[in-house]
Interface confidence: medium
């Protein structure tokens, strides 16, 4: 009878013995398994990342196509108004020109003399730029860079005038110091009798005949 | 107050050469153009050379030109003229000044004499 359990107890260890070694076998297996699987997890989810991704973007190139058409049709359908009008009315800016507070502006890429810059402001139902403010001033310097550029402004014909008829004495001056000094040490003839911006924004007199770079600018009109 | 003081003149034989120096003082030196003139013996002023504030551009008298060369250096506030190639002609006071629609600030000037 010992003999039989010391049998029974043999067998009962070797199958313990074979079940842990299965049992561990199985669990390595398992693991690799969820191993593989966790990998493949991963790659699926950082596809979808990456087209969630694409997917916005796309969606804010559409939306920036979409308020550029938007922009495009109202600009078109404005010209055309004012085509119509004779362009006795301008209730939005040309194309090409930039919109600020109620004007367009044209930036110049060329240079000329003021009074040619004058003419071809004048061509274009717009006048020489005239500046009223600091926060103009600053959206000009922001369009132009660091260029010398004729303002409208001149004292050809005595004081100092805008072109528009804006009041020169009470309104916003950003002369550099200690100009305008009307100098003709230049020996060009005569003194200096057109504004321009300077490279560093503020204003300076200087002789009409340079060639600089100009700023036309034309109010609009309020939309009924 | 503004004050103007020249210094170089001299007495140079044709041909030779001066330099002249104006110290500035009592405004913004870096942002106003500035002249040389000159008179000389019984005659009246002439207009030499021009300089604008940041020394970008100069100009010159048809009868210096190529032979003067003006220049300014602003750290230390002071105008130059260099003269080459003297001639009896250029013999005069030669002043600087800072101008404007009239030159309303003067140097005491600097004899430059040409003699062999």
């Known amino acids: 009878q010992n003999s039989q359990l010391r049998e029974d107890l043999l067998a009962l260890r070797q199958n313990f013995s074979n079940l842990t070694v299965s049992t561990e076998d199985q669990v390595k297996a398992l693991s690799t398994q969820g191993s593989s699987v966790g990998r493949k997890m991963k790659l699926v989810e950082s596809k979808l990342e990456k087209q969630q991704k694409d997917l916005t973007e796309d969606h804010s190139s559409l939306l920036l196509h979409v308020k550029q058409l938007v922009s495009d049709v109202r600009s078109l359908s404005c010209q055309m108004a004012a085509f119509r009008g004779n362009g006795s009315e301008r209730t939005c800016c040309p194309i090409n020109w930039v919109e600020y507070e109620g004007s367009c502006y044209w930036f110049s890429s060329s240079v000329r003399p003021w009074t040619e810059a004058d003419k071809y402001c004048q061509l274009e139902n717009a006048h020489l730029v005239v500046v009223t403010s600091r926060d103009e001033q600053n959206f000009l310097q922001r369009h132009m860079g660091p260029l010398n550029t004729w303002i409208g402004l001149t004292d050809q014909n005595g004081p100092w005038k805008w072109v528009d008829g804006t009041d020169y004495e009470t309104g916003f001056q950003n002369w550099r110091p200690e100009q305008p000094d009307n100098w003709y040490g230049h020996g060009l003839g005569g003194g200096e009798d057109c504004a321009h911006f300077t490279t560093d924004g503020r204003w300076n007199d200087d002789v009409c005949r340079r060639p600089y770079r100009w700023v036309c600018e034309t109010k609009l009109d309020k939309a009924n | 107050e503004v004050q103007l003081l020249e210094s170089g003149g001299g007495l140079v034989q044709p041909g030779g050469s001066l330099r002249l120096s104006c110290a500035a003082s009592?405004?913004?030196?870096?942002?106003?153009?500035m002249i040389w003139v000159r008179q000389a013996p019984g005659k009246g002023l002439e207009w030499v050379s021009g300089?604008?504030?940041?020394?970008?551009?100069?100009y010159y008298a048809d009868s210096v030109k190529g032979r003067f060369t003006i220049s300014r250096d602003n750290s230390k506030n002071t105008l130059y003229l260099q003269m080459n190639s003297l001639r009896a002609e250029d013999a005069a006071v030669y002043y600087c000044?800072?101008?404007?629609?009239?030159?309303?600030?003067w140097g005491q000037g600097t004899l430059v004499t040409v003699s062999s």
């Open positions: 000044a800072k101008s404007g629609s009239s030159f309303d600030y």
């Open positions: 009592g405004f913004t030196f870096e942002t106003q153009p």
């Open positions: 300089i604008e504030g940041d020394g970008g551009r100069t």
